[in-house]
């Protein structure tokens, strides 16, 4: 179904991974497709097999090296191709000259932990994962807190406009269970987008002491 609407989107995690999604309406679920990466100034080529993630979309990760190795720079251009098997031959279905540092999506922050918790406040820290040293401090974060009886979508976003890997949540309710998530985005890149949200960190505020407010 070549005439069905199709789209090919990839992001670079800033180190050694390009994640791609290929979608095509009307394509057969058992179609065998792959992504091929051909850099303009590197000696390596890389291929990954597209695996179904929904009725009409497939995804794969181009693993370029060890997770923390810096495999691409701001001057690299990687020609990407979607190839699908048709009988005995491979057919090119999509092509793109990909500038990695214009299309960034970092890994979700990791190692979330409660540094200190009180009745109305909680200090939380986290770490970024597999982020290029090129960014130096040019990163921003968004955080959200899940309160009882609400959904993540209803949670207000807290914006940290600098590389600050901690937050002090205030005006919390005593003896209450909360969850917390954070995501990161480099300031660089015309098509750069937010990382996935971190795994939620559950915490509970301390109960109010009888007869006094902490």
């Amino acid at each position: 179904a070549v005439n069905g609407t199709s789209q090919f989107t990839c992001f670079y995690n800033s180190r050694a991974n390009i994640s791609c999604v290929w979608s095509q309406d009307g394509a057969l679920q058992d179609t065998s497709c792959q992504v091929h990466a051909w850099p303009d100034r590197r000696r390596w080529n890389q291929t990954c097999e597209l695996l179904p993630v929904s009725q009409a979309s497939w995804a794969c990760n181009l693993i370029l090296g060890a997770p923390d190795s810096q495999k691409l720079t701001t001057v690299d251009i990687v020609t990407l191709r979607v190839l699908c098997r048709e009988g005995v031959r491979w057919r090119v279905m999509a092509i793109q000259d990909f500038k990695p540092f214009e299309n960034l999506r970092l890994m979700a922050p990791i190692s979330l932990q409660v540094v200190h918790v009180e009745t109305h406040r909680c200090n939380i820290s986290w770490e970024i994962s597999q982020a290029s040293h090129y960014f130096e401090r040019h990163l921003e974060f968004e955080a959200r807190t899940l309160s009882p009886g609400h959904t993540w979508e209803e949670a207000p976003l807290l914006t940290l406009k600098q590389k600050q890997e901690w937050i002090c949540l205030e005006t919390l309710t005593p003896d209450t269970q909360y969850e917390f998530q954070v995501r990161v985005k480099p300031l660089q890149g015309e098509f750069t987008t937010w990382s996935p949200w971190s795994q939620p960190l559950a915490f509970r505020t301390k109960p109010a002491a009888l007869g006094k407010d902490t």
Epitope: N3, S6, Q7, F8, T79, R81, M93, A94, I95, D97
Partner: nanobody, 125 residues
Framework: EVQLVESGGGLVQAGGSLRLSCAAS????????MGWFRQAPGKEREFVAA????????MYAESVEGRFTISRENAKNMVYLQMNSLKPEDTAIYYC??????????????????WGQGTQATVSS
């Protein structure tokens, strides 16, 4: 915003050649993937060929592979379609298209934001 103007169409005998040109205006041309589509009388518009912005990547419809060649000259804001060994079934209006900025060139019309008015190519038998 990219404006596209095609030229080079005409009447040619089967087995002959034509070279279509697409002149683009707009600052983003040099980093935009480009494609050619065609529409024969009474038929839907179909993909013909596409090229990445550096020219490193190309793809073709099965029906034209080996006969047509897409190329580009970014310094002149031009895209070309060299059509050899033409057949009567290649008769169509040929359209130049610019892919969505920062996005891949695909085989479906929906992946392209900007279109030219088209140029007629007629192949007689």
């Amino acid at each position: 915003e990219v404006q596209l103007v095609e030229s080079g169409g005409g009447l040619v005998q089967a087995g002959g050649s034509l070279r279509l040109s697409c002149a683009a205006s707009g600052r983003t041309f040099s980093t935009t993937e480009m494609g050619w589509f065609r529409q024969a009388p009474g038929k839907e518009r179909e993909f013909v060929a596409a090229i990445t912005w550096t020219g490193r990547g190309t793809m073709y419809a099965e029906s034209v592979e080996g006969r047509f060649t897409i190329s580009r000259e970014n310094a002149k804001n031009m895209v070309y379609l060299q059509m050899n060994s033409l057949k009567p079934e290649d008769t169509a209006i040929y359209y130049c298209a610019a892919a969505r900025r920062g996005r891949a060139a695909v085989r479906s019309e929906g992946g392209y934001d900007f279109w030219g008015q088209g140029t007629q190519a007629t192949v007689s038998s």
